[in-house]
């Protein structure tokens, strides 16, 4: 059903919104032991003028990264509404640009036990922490877009 | 529409500091990471630093030790600090607001440092 | 650091001609199926403009006669029919690895 502009949003609000939501919802705690530093994807990946559909695929490519992260299933469920969702109404918007498909990420070189036990709670942390931002902007960035098709 | 406008620059001796600003405006200055680069007369471009909506900052390892990169979100303003100044630092120095892709979307005017006893 | 080297460092052209600016990367520049590689004008006096990001990409109001091409390490910039108020110096710029980093710069000037 293809009309997010028609309908004032309603595709986006009844669907993609209630599920960023409930997964931000579900990490509010998360954000407090976050480092600062800047994510490359971030400052790579911006949602600015004339650019939002570009922004948007590539972190709806980058959310189904995280489908298989041994989380719950309701909140597997919501994170694949947001991807699926997102790259749907791009293509109901005529937003969506295609490119090549993503690189596997490499392998890690092997570590002790104990330093690979701590290194992978970091890294699970850092992703989440990754992962609430990534919600965050693309939440964001819709908003702008429907202002946007609301104002013409 | 978006505008950055560089000031501070000038004569200064070698080993002296300066403080470079370039005032923000046309765009929400917070949520962007912005970057200084500079261009001695004559020669290329040369990235200098970048400072991230949250303060996270990044630095050419190069100038790390003598340059330092700030930001005051509620003044629109970003700053680089720069001390033991050499003649080689004579240059144009430009703000540039970070775009898609890392890029440098937009410029400032530039403003001329040169370092001279 | 990553290095960049651009061809020619200059050329003569005339008005209407088809101009191609070549850049090479010391490594790859891609991540995540993305080429981080950018493109920039700059005019004497004045500050560098951004034509083309991420390889192919054209910047708003850039004229379409500019084109950008290539992954990896090897990188084309096109100008498909050259204009007067085209003669300038053209940088490409890498942004996957800190620190970011320029091309040596191409002077397009008037034959």
């Known amino acids: 059903d293809c009309d997010i502009e028609g309908k004032d949003g309603k595709q986006y609000e009844s669907v993609l919104m209630v599920s960023i939501d409930q997964l931000l919802d579900s990490m509010k705690e998360i954000g407090s032991n976050c480092l600062n530093n800047e994510f490359n994807f971030f400052k790579r990946h911006i949602c600015d003028a004339n650019k939002e559909g570009m922004f948007l695929f590539r972190a709806a490519r980058k959310l189904r990264q995280f489908l298989k992260m041994n989380s719950t299933g309701d909140f597997d469920l919501h994170l694949l509404k947001v991807s699926e969702g997102t790259t749907i109404l791009l293509n109901c918007t005529g937003q969506v640009k295609g490119r090549k498909p993503a690189a596997l990420g490499e392998a890690q070189p092997t570590k002790s036990l104990e330093e690979n036990k701590s290194l992978k709670e970091q890294k699970k942390l850092n992703d989440l922490c990754f992962l609430k931002r990534l919600l965050q902007e693309i939440k964001t960035c819709w908003n702008k877009i429907l202002m946007g098709t609301k104002e013409h | 529409q978006v505008q950055l406008v560089e000031s501070g620059g000038g004569v200064v001796q070698p080993g002296r500091s300066l403080r470079l600003s370039c005032a923000a405006s046309g765009f929400t200055f917070s949520t962007y990471g912005v970057h200084w680069v500079r261009q001695a007369p004559g020669k290329g471009l040369e990235w200098l630093a970048a400072?991230?909506?949250?303060?996270?900052?990044d630095y050419n390892v190069a100038f790390s030790s003598r340059f330092t990169i700030s930001r005051d979100n509620s003044k629109n303003t970003l700053y680089l600090q720069m001390n033991s100044l050499r003649a080689e630092d004579t240059a144009v120095y430009y703000c540039?607001?970070?775009?898609?892709?890392?890029?440098?979307?937009?410029w400032g005017q530039g403003t001329l440092v040169t370092v001279s006893s | 650091d990553i290095q960049m080297t651009q061809s020619p460092s200059s050329l003569s052209a005339s008005v209407g001609d088809r101009v191609t600016i070549t850049c090479k990367a010391s490594q790859s520049v891609d991540d995540d199926g993305d080429s981080y590689m950018n493109w920039y004008q700059q005019k004497p006096g004045k500050a560098p403009k951004l034509l083309i990001y991420m390889a192919s990409n054209l910047e708003s109001g850039v004229p379409a006669r500019f084109s950008g091409s290539g992954s990896g390490t090897d990188f084309t910039l096109t100008i498909s029919s050259l204009q007067p108020e085209d003669f300038a110096t053209y940088y490409c710029q890498q942004s996957n690895e800190d620190p970011l980093t320029f091309g040596g710069g191409t002077k397009v000037e008037i034959k």
């Open positions: 400072i991230w909506s949250g303060g996270s900052t």
């Open positions: 540039a607001r970070n775009g898609y892709g890392e890029s440098f979307a937009y």
